[in-house]
Amino acid sequence: ASNFDCCLGYTDRILHPKFIVGFTRQLANEGCDINAIIFHTKKKLSVCANPKQTWVKYIVRLLSKKVKNM
């Protein structure tokens, strides 16, 4: 659900943290229409996720912790 570098909508699937290697924040006030978390998977896919959903918040926290520990 992305066009060029902007997410236009959100995935309707839930990703397990073990498949995600990183994320990027998309902010609506920085040239895109919606706020989003773009998850980057091990298979080099980019998945647009709703930043207000609980599963997204948990994965962002898990990934942020990983980065700090590196």
Epitope: I14, H16, P17, N35, N50, P51, K52, Q53, T54, W55, K57, Y58, I59, V60, R61, L62, S64, K65
Partner: antibody, heavy 125, light 110 residues
């Protein structure tokens, strides 16, 4: 109706560990976020961390990182909170709580609708 | 100390309207939904308002929530003696990557 039942009160010595259980009944377990919240005597609420059982990996508040372990057993629908290297400042009532909607909900993120009865943990020498 | 602040106390007489403020920042209230909890003395907290302004079933319509920018507020209209309790706002914080509770407000019915 969802119910969360916690283990009983504990008295612990400084430097020891405590493990509190939270058994869920009356609803799906694995796709809901469970949080642990504590409240020291006369103080406010403090979010400690949480777990989505299907994700297996918990998240923790920074200040408790290294001392706190949160786990979930999907075979018994039970969440656990273990706090190690206890100090007097850890004396508090510890609550487990479950979110209103499942982990895909965006309108109920953090909305802790179901709460356990609380477990008083006293740390004293 | 908490990144979300509330006045320590508020009071009113029965029937009055009482409003509790909750002040945060762009990373919490400004970009996430706000939930409100009521805690009666000696009991577990109870979800009072979720998603800024939604009431779970069983919560009287005397309670209402609102949000504007980086602040939120809880209004209790027609204050009753059983409303005497501690009230907490809460939201996810995207900078801290954790859930944060407000400092809490003790409501007294005079």
């Amino acid at each position: 109706e969802v119910q969360l039942v916690q283990s009983g009160p504990e008295v612990k010595k400084p430097g020891s560990s405590v493990k509190v259980s939270c058994r869920a009944s009356g609803g799906t377990f694995s796709t809901y976020a469970f949080s642990w919240v504590r409240q020291a005597p006369g103080q406010g609420l403090e979010w400690m961390g949480g777990i989505i059982p299907v994700f297996e990996t918990p998240i923790y508040a920074q200040k408790l990182q290294g001392r706190l372990t949160i786990t979930a057993d999907t075979s018994t629908d039970t969440a656990y909170m273990e706090l190690s290297n206890l100090r007097s400042g850890d004396t508090a009532v510890y609550y487990c709580a479950r979110e209103w909607g499942d982990y895909y909900s965006s309108v109920s993120s953090g909305a802790l609708h179901y709460w356990g009865q609380g477990t008083l943990v006293t740390v004293s020498s | 100390q908490s990144v979300v602040t509330q006045p320590p106390s508020a009071s009113g007489t029965p029937g009055q309207r009482v409003t509790i403020s909750c002040s945060g920042s762009r990373s919490n209230i400004g970009s996430n939904i706000v939930n409100w909890y009521q805690q009666l003395v000696g009991t577990a907290p109870k979800l009072l308002i979720y998603s800024d302004n939604q009431r779970p079933s069983g919560v009287p319509d005397r309670f209402s929530g609102s949000k504007s920018g980086t602040s939120a507020s809880l209004a209790i209209s027609g204050l009753q003696s059983e409303d005497e309790a501690d009230y907490y706002c809460a939201a996810w914080d995207d900078s801290l990557n954790r859930y944060v509770f407000g400092t809490g407000t003790k409501v007294t019915v005079l």
